[in-house]
C-alpha cells in the first residue's frame, strides 16, 4: 500500500515536471524523455482496483462546445456562409472518413498526421485530414469539370495541438473552391477577395494576405542549386521564416536538409524579401530568375493577379512575400494565407498568438491524381481556419464581458395568477404555430417574478402575461423585459405585435 | 538475487582509457534506466552519466562530457562506461547504480564500486 | 546546475537520540529529493526518496520532509548502526547532484 502511495506520489510529481517542462517551452528532446519516463511510471502504477480512477474528459485536442461557444460559432459560421453564397457557391459533404489510398502521397511531410481507422471489414479508412482532397476525389469520381462549392464540415489532424491558441485534433475548415478551366487569375483574385471580404465582416482585427506561387519557389531553388529531390523538404524549412529567424531556418536546411551553405545562402537572398507589385516588376528584371521558365510564369501571373486585386479594392491587403511555401504537396500555383497583424487584445491583455487565420492556393494537378487517364482539372480555393477564429471572438467577447444570448426566445407566456397552465399552453401553441419563438415554464404555478428573472438570465425580450381578467377581456399583457412597460393587446394582434417588436418578416416566407 | 557487480577499473596513466563494465542480475534489467556515480577518495559523490532502458536517451556530467561513453547491452544485461583521455581528477571509486521505479534518477540498487586511479 | 548544502557537516549524538539533517536547494526542487546512508568502504544505502517516501525494508525511525528548497532528515532514535555518512541528492533536473555530506558520530 505505502508503495503504491510512493509510485502515485511520483506520478503526480512526475506530471507536474512535464507540464512545467512545457510551459518553459524546454527542448523536445527534453519534454519527450520526461513525458516517456511519466508513462513508465503509470505503467507500472497499473489500474487500481480500489477506485477505478477513470478520469471523465474528451479526448486530447478535442473539446465540447458549451451553448454560449456554440452561439457564437454560428455567429461565425453565418459571416462566412452568407459571403460564400454572395459569390454564388453550391455545397455539398462527403464522408468524415475516406479509403486510407485516397489520402495518400497528397500531403507530403504532413501525412503523418492522418488519423487511421481500425480495421472495417477489409476497407483501409482514414478519417480525413482536409476537405480539398476529398473534394477532388468528388470531381473525378462524379466526372465534374466545373464547380463552384464551398464545404464546412470537421477534419482530423494526429497533431500536437496547442489548445489554448486555437489548435484542436479535430476541428472544422470552411473551404470555398471553384473547379474549372477559366482565364488565369481571375478565380485565384475572387478567392483572395472573399478571404478578405470574410476577415473583414468578422471584425477580429487587422490582417494582412501573403501571396507567393509555388512556380516562383521551384524556379527559384532551381537556379539557386537545390536539387528536384530537396524542393519539397526545403519548402517546408523556408514555411517557417514567419515563426523563426532565417538563421534558424538556414542552420535546419544546411544541418539537417544537408543544403549546401551558399546555396541557403542564395535562397535567403530571395526569401526574406516581401512587398507588392513592385517587387514582382523587381523580380521580372531579376537576371537569374527571369530566366526559369516556371518563375517566369508565376511572375507573369502574380503580376495579373494584383492589377485583379486593385479592380476588387484589396490590394491594401496582400503582400507578396517569398518566404510562403505552404507545407502541402498539392499546390502548384498561386498560394496565400491570411495571417493577422495584431489580435485585438484589450490594454494590458497578452495578445492572442494564433497566427494564420485562413489560407489557399491553387492546385491543378489534384484532381488527376484520381483520374484513371490523368485528365486534369484546374483548381483554386480558400480555407477559413475557424477554430482560431472562434478563440479569438470568444476571448475577446470574453474581454468586453459581453452578454452572448444563446437562445432566440422571442416571447415567455407567463402567467400573473394560479391555474392558468392551460391557458398558458394554449397561448404558447398558437405562438409557435405563427412562427415565434416562445418558450413557457414548466411549472402548473409559477410566480411570475421567477418568470421575469428566467427573461432577464436568458434575454428573452418580451414576456406575454396571462391574467384573469385579460382572459375575460380577451386581451394580453405584453410586456418588454428591459424597459417594463405593458400594454394590453387583443389576443388576435399578438402575434404581428411580436414580430413587429422583435423585427421580425410578418410572413413566414 | 538482485544485485549489481562493477569491474574494470585499475590504475591508469593520464591521457589513458579503461572501460568499466557492471553485471546486473535478479531484475528485468532492461526496463531500468542506468547510471554511474563516482566518489573521489575521502569526497563526495558524483553523477556521472545515465542511460535509459531503451538506449534512446543519455546525459553526461560536464566534467566527462565527450571524454566518457555510456553504453548497456540488454541481452547480456550489462552497462559500460568507456572512459578515454582520462585525467587526475577522474580518480574515484565508480558505483553504477540503478534508478527507483524503472525512471526516476534516484538510485535504490547499487554495485560494490570498482576503483579507478589516473596517476603518472 | 543545482547546489545542494547540508548542515550540519558532521554531528555526534548518543544512541536513542532524536537527530536532525538539513539540506537546502540553490533552487526550488519540488520534492525531488532523496537521503542516502554510506558506510565507509560501502555504496550508499537508499533510505528515502521522494522527499518523505520511505525505501523499502529501511527502518521507520528513519523519516523525510520538506519540500521546494528546505528538506529535513529525522531519525528518531538513533541505533547503533545508524552512524554514518548521510547524503542528500536531488533528482529534479540533471545533473542531479549530492549534499556534501553529513558525518554522524557517536558522542
Known amino acids: 500500500m505505502a508503495e503504491r502511495a510512493a509510485l502515485e506520489e511520483l506520478v503526480k510529481l512526475q506530471g507536474e515536471r512535464v507540464r512545467g517542462l512545457k510551459q518553459q517551452k524546454a527542448s523536445a528532446e527534453l519534454i519527450e524523455e520526461e513525458v516517456a519516463k511519466l508513462l513508465k511510471l503509470k505503467a507500472q502504477l497499473g489500474p487500481d482496483e480500489s477506485k477505478q480512477k477513470f478520469v471523465l474528459k474528451t479526448p486530447k485536442g478535442t473539446r465540447d462546445y458549451s451553448p454560449r461557444q456554440m452561439a457564437v460559432r454560428e455567429k461565425v459560421f453565418d459571416v462566412i456562409i452568407r459571403c460564400f453564397k454572395r459569390h454564388g457557391a453550391e455545397v455539398i459533404d462527403t464522408p468524415v472518413f475516406e479509403l486510407k489510398e485516397t489520402l495518400m502521397g497528397k500531403y507530403g511531410e504532413d501525412s503523418k498526421l492522418i488519423y487511421d481507422l481500425k480495421d472495417q471489414g477489409g476497407e483501409l479508412l482514414s478519417l480525413r485530414y482536409d476537405l480539398t482532397v476529398p473534394f477532388a476525389r468528388y470531381l473525378a469520381m462524379n466526372k465534374l469539370t466545373n464547380i463552384k462549392r464551398y464545404h464546412i464540415a470537421k477534419v482530423y489532424r494526429r497533431d500536437n495541438p496547442a489548445m489554448t491558441r486555437g489548435r484542436y485534433r479535430e476541428f472544422y475548415q470552411c473551404d470555398f473552391d471553384i473547379a474549372g478551366n477559366f482565364d488565369p487569375m481571375i478565380p485565384d483574385a475572387e478567392c483572395l477577395k472573399i478571404m478578405c471580404e470574410i476577415l473583414s465582416s468578422l471584425q477580429i482585427g487587422d490582417f494582412l494576405v501573403k501571396v507567393n506561387d509555388r512556380r516562383i519557389l521551384d524556379g527559384m531553388f532551381a537556379i539557386c542549386g537545390v536539387s528536384d529531390s530537396k524542393f519539397r523538404t526545403i519548402c517546408s524549412s523556408v514555411d517557417k521564416l514567419d515563426k523563426v529567424s532565417w538563421e534558424e531556418v538556414k542552420n535546419e536546411m544546411v544541418g539537417e536538409k544537408g543544403l549546401a551553405p551558399e546555396v541557403a545562402d542564395r535562397i535567403g537572398d530571395y526569401v526574406q524579401q516581401h512587398g507588392g507589385v513592385s517587387l514582382v516588376e523587381q523580380l521580372l528584371q531579376d537576371p537569374k530568375l527571369s530566366q526559369n521558365k516556371q518563375a517566369l510564369e508565376g511572375l507573369g501571373d502574380l503580376k495579373l493577379l494584383f492589377e485583379y486585386l486593385t479592380l476588387f479594392g484589396i490590394d491594401d491587403k496582400i503582400s507578396f512575400d517569398l518566404s510562403l511555401a505552404r507545407g502541402l504537396d498539392y499546390y502548384t500555383g498561386v498560394i496565400y494565407e491570411a495571417v493577422l497583424l495584431q489580435t485585438p487584445a484589450q490594454a494590458g491583455e497578452e495578445p492572442l498568438g494564433v497566427g494564420s487565420v485562413a489560407a489557399g492556393g491553387r492546385y491543378d494537378g489534384l484532381v488527376g491524381m484520381f483520374d484513371p487517364k490523368g485528365r486534369k482539372v484546374p483548381c483554386v480555393g480558400l480555407s477559413i481556419g475557424v477554430e482560431r477564429i472562434f478563440s479569438i471572438v470568444e476571448q475577446r467577447l470574453e474581454a468586453l464581458e459581453e452578454k452572448i444570448r444563446t437562445t432566440e426566445t422571442q416571447v415567455l407566456v407567463a402567467s400573473a395568477q394560479k391555474k392558468l397552465l392551460e391557458e398558458r399552453l394554449k397561448l404558447v401553441s398558437e405562438l409557435w404555430d405563427a412562427g415565434i419563438k416562445a418558450e413557457l415554464l414548466y411549472k402548473k404555478n409559477p410566480k411570475l417574478l421567477n418568470q421575469l428573472q428566467y427573461c432577464e438570465e436568458a434575454g428573452i425580450p418580451l414576456v406575454a402575461i396571462i391574467g384573469e381578467q385579460e382572459l375575460k377581456d380577451g386581451v394580453i399583457k405584453l410586456r418588454s423585459v428591459t424597459s417594463r412597460e405593458e400594454v394590453d393587446v387583443r389576443r388576435e394582434d399578438l402575434v404581428e405585435e411580436i414580430k413587429r417588436r422583435t423585427g421580425q418578416p410578418l410572413c413566414i416566407c | 538475487q538482485v544485485q549489481l557487480v562493477e569491474s574494470g577499473g585499475g590504475l591508469v596513466k593520464p591521457g589513458g582509457s579503461l572501460r568499466l563494465s557492471c553485471a546486473a542480475s535478479g531484475f528485468t534489467f532492461s526496463d531500468y534506466y542506468m547510471t554511474w556515480i563516482r566518489q573521489a577518495p575521502g569526497k563526495g559523490l558524483e553523477w556521472v552519466s545515465y542511460?535509459?532502458?531503451?538506449?534512446?536517451?543519455?546525459n553526461y556530467a560536464p566534467s566527462v562530457k565527450g571524454r566518457f561513453t555510456i553504453s548497456r547491452d540488454n541481452a547480456k544485461n550489462s552497462l559500460y562506461l568507456q572512459m578515454n583521455s582520462l585525467r587526475d581528477e577522474d580518480t574515484a571509486v565508480y558505483f553504477c547504480?540503478?534508478?527507483?521505479?524503472?525512471?526516476?534518477?534516484?538510485?535504490?540498487?547499487w554495485g560494490q564500486g570498482t576503483l579507478v586511479t589516473v596517476s603518472s | 546546475d543545482i547546489q545542494m548544502t547540508q548542515s550540519p557537516s558532521s554531528v555526534s549524538a548518543s544512541v536513542g537520540d532524536r537527530v536532525t539533517i538539513t539540506c537546502r536547494a540553490s533552487q526550488g526542487i519540488s520534492s525531488w529529493l532523496a537521503w542516502y546512508q554510506q558506510k565507509p568502504g560501502r555504496a550508499p544505502k537508499l533510505l528515502i526518496f521522494?522527499?518523505?517516501s520511505l525505501q523499502s525494508g529501511v527502518p521507520s525511525r528513519f523519516s523525510g520532509s520538506g519540500s521546494g528548497t528546505h528538506f529535513t532528515l529525522t531519525i528518531s532514535s538513533l541505533q547503533p548502526e545508524d552512524f554514518a555518512t548521510y547524503y542528500c541528492?536531488?533528482?529534479?533536473?540533471?545533473?542531479?547532484?549530492f549534499g556534501q555530506g553529513t558525518k554522524l558520530e557517536i558522542k
Open positions: 521522494a522527499a518523505s
Open positions: 542511460i535509459s532502458g531503451s538506449f534512446r536517451y543519455t
Open positions: 547504480a540503478r534508478y527507483v521505479y524503472q525512471v526516476v534518477a534516484i538510485g535504490d540498487l
Open positions: 541528492q536531488q533528482a529534479e533536473s540533471f545533473p542531479y547532484t
